[in-house]
């Protein structure tokens, strides 16, 4: 095959090599960019900046090599459009620094930076950490800072991410209240800060105020949906990013729902309870307190992380006709109480029949409440015979 005369030539099925001296000053309009998985660039003294727009359209790129070129600056978001990048070789360029943001979100197996005039500062603390933790093949490169010695020896005592403190109200918050949160940011070289409110949706009207180092957030006319929702303050500096999440507890009265008994490995009377603070529960059976035991007890399902409602069962492991009756669940917290009742019939009473009647041999339990009288299917029902002597 004739040698390729272009600045960049195909290499393998999905690679491109750009090695002709000084032919490139940017990576715009590379041929076949959308299918490239490997890009090798060498001897490009005019290629000094690598920015977001340079790698747009290179979504399949896995290996990027830019060596022995004039690269001075890589933008923090340069690799936003190349999420699959796993090998990055930027050796023997003119890089003095590289932001932690540049590699954030990538799963780099290899990062090569040897031969650059790196300047030791807190901005390279992340790279020092990679070296300490053996990540990306960095330790083997024995990286040096220009005129300052090994990167590994860089003092890092003052190189911390921002420190955040979020102040939340001490007093009880009620539905309809306005809540002021304040986020105090401390640290060196603060760059950006803000709030993440993605979980809030319709939980409150949001108003942001202030800026670094003190951010304000007003949650107006809060609803009970605000409970268990994260409100997150974040801040970044050249070392990294910090986040602190808080939750605002909005008080509201207890509520309770009961559902038709179902057989789920023995029997379950399903319930849902809500309230903040979490309500205490008590069961009544035919109006009397039901003492829980290992064969009749309350069992909660795993709670959802972002809501106050709890779902569960009153478990009846071996109910017979003596357990038929009215079940009431009482829920109470300091803001109110609620109750719900349901009739449950697990098994017919084998001793309640006329001697002239046929002897029952199996049962079809029926569970009813005020709105439904549908029969409940009971599996694994043991046939039950009753013999009667009539004198």
């Amino acid at each position: 095959a004739a040698p390729c005369p272009d600045a960049c030539c195909p290499h393998g099925s999905s690679g491109l090599r750009c090695t002709r001296d000084g032919a490139l000053d940017s990576l715009h309009h590379l041929p076949g960019a959308e299918n490239l998985t490997e890009l090798y660039i060498e001897n490009q003294q005019h290629l000094q900046h690598l920015e977001l727009r340079d790698l747009r359209g290179l979504g399949e790129l896995r290996n990027l090599t830019i060596v022995k070129s004039g690269l001075r600056f890589v933008a923090p978001d340069a690799f936003h459009f190349t999420p699959r990048l796993s090998r990055l070789n930027l050796s023997f360029n003119a890089l003095e620094s590289l932001s932690w943001k540049t590699v954030q979100g990538l799963s780099l197996q290899e990062l090569v930076l040897s031969g650059n005039p790196l300047h030791c500062s807190c901005a390279l603390r992340w790279l020092q950490r990679w070296e300490e933790e053996g990540l990306g093949g960095v330790p083997e490169q024995k990286l040096q800072c220009h005129g300052q010695g090994p990167l590994a020896h860089m003092p890092n005592a003052s190189c911390g991410v921002p420190t955040l403190k979020v102040q939340v109200p001490n007093a009880s918050v009620d539905v309809g209240d306005d809540v002021l949160l304040r986020c105090q940011v401390e640290g060196r070289g603060l760059e950006q800060a803000g709030w993440i409110l993605t979980e809030l949706e319709q939980s409150a009207t949001v108003m942001k105020s202030g800026g670094l180092p003190s951010l304000g957030l007003t949650l107006a006319n809060v609803t009970s949906d605000l409970n268990r929702k994260n409100v997150t303050c974040w801040a970044e500096n050249d070392v990294g990013r910090a986040e602190v999440s808080v939750q605002v507890n909005v008080s509201f009265p207890a509520s309770v729902q009961l559902h038709t008994a179902v057989e789920m490995h023995h029997w379950c009377i399903p319930f849902s309870v809500d309230g903040q603070p979490a309500p205490s529960l008590r069961w009544l059976f035919n109006g009397s307190v039901l003492n829980e035991t290992s064969f009749i007890f309350t069992e909660f399902l795993e709670p959802a992380a972002n809501e106050t409602v709890r779902h569960g069962c009153l478990r009846l492991n071996q109910p017979t006709h003596v357990n038929n009756g009215n079940y009431t669940l009482l829920a109470a917290n300091p803001f109110g109480q609620a109750s719900a009742s349901i009739m449950a019939a697990f098994m017919d009473n084998p001793f309640e029949f006329n001697p002239e009647d046929p002897i029952p041999v199996s049962f079809s339990p029926v569970d009813t409440n005020s709105t439904s009288g549908d029969p409940v299917e009971k599996k694994d029902e043991t046939p039950f015979g009753v013999s009667v002597a009539v004198g």
Epitope: H265, H266, N291, E292, T293, S294, F295, F297, T298, E299, F300, R315, N317, Q318, P319, T320, V322, M347, T382
Partner: antibody, heavy 117, light 106 residues
């Protein structure tokens, strides 16, 4: 697999107390009731009580209500039974056993308690 | 409390023989459970919910009954079945056990 580990033996003096442990592994400790059952030499099984680690609910056999105390330490998945005012009649093997939807599915190996001066 | 009376207290059977032991409750219980215990070991759950065999229990074992009268049956005795069998109720506090039936091999 499910394990309920109990110490092999305890020797205690009359009038003293003993605190027996039952360390659980291989399942979610808080989801199961823990029972304590004793068996005197050559005798049958006697239920002492049960505890639900999920909420600390305890039920006792009236016979032991004033002398037995059942507790749990959720952080170590361990159940305890303390029995006080011991007499020679309390010399027995003490078992822990767990239940959820079916009775006493798994048992510990038992701790042999000897009350002797 | 519910008192459970097991009979016989001791019995022996030859290999291949059918064995039945009973458990009588002082008041009606919904289900009965049975445990097997061999000398020097912990009890094992053997039959639960009156008639369900615990994992690993041979199918020659069966359980039946209702109300106050329950039984455990071995259709064909084998040497490894020699043990003490306890019935238990799980319907009211305190939970109670029968005094046991010791089954020996002839």
């Amino acid at each position: 697999q499910v394990q309920l580990q109990q110490p092999g033996a305890e020797l205690v003096k009359p009038g003293a107390s003993v605190k027996l442990s039952c360390k659980s592994s291989g399942y979610t400790f808080t989801n199961y009731w823990m029972h304590w059952v004793r068996q005197r030499p050559g005798q049958g099984l006697e239920w002492i009580g049960e505890i639900y680690p999920n909420n600390g609910r305890v039920n006792y056999n009236e016979k032991f209500k004033n002398r037995a105390t059942l507790t749990v330490d959720i952080s170590s998945s361990t159940a305890y039974m303390q029995l006080s005012s011991l007499t020679s009649e309390d010399s027995a093997v003490y078992y822990c056993a767990r239940s959820r939807y079916d009775p006493m599915e798994d048992w510990g190996q038992g701790t042999s308690v000897t009350v002797s001066s | 409390q519910v008192v459970l009376t097991q009979s016989p207290a001791i019995m022996s059977a030859s290999p291949g023989e059918k064995v039945t032991m009973t458990c009588s409750a002082s008041s009606s219980v919904g289900y009965m459970h049975w445990y097997q215990q061999k000398s020097g070991t912990s009890p094992k759950r053997w039959i639960y919910d009156t008639s369900k065999l615990a994992s690993g229990v041979p199918t020659r074992f069966s359980g039946s009954g209702s109300g106050t009268s329950y039984s455990l049956t071995i259709s064909s005795m084998e040497a490894e079945d020699a043990a003490t069998y306890f019935c238990q109720q799980w319907s009211s506090i305190p939970l109670t056990f029968g005094s046991g039936t010791r089954l020996e091999i002839k």
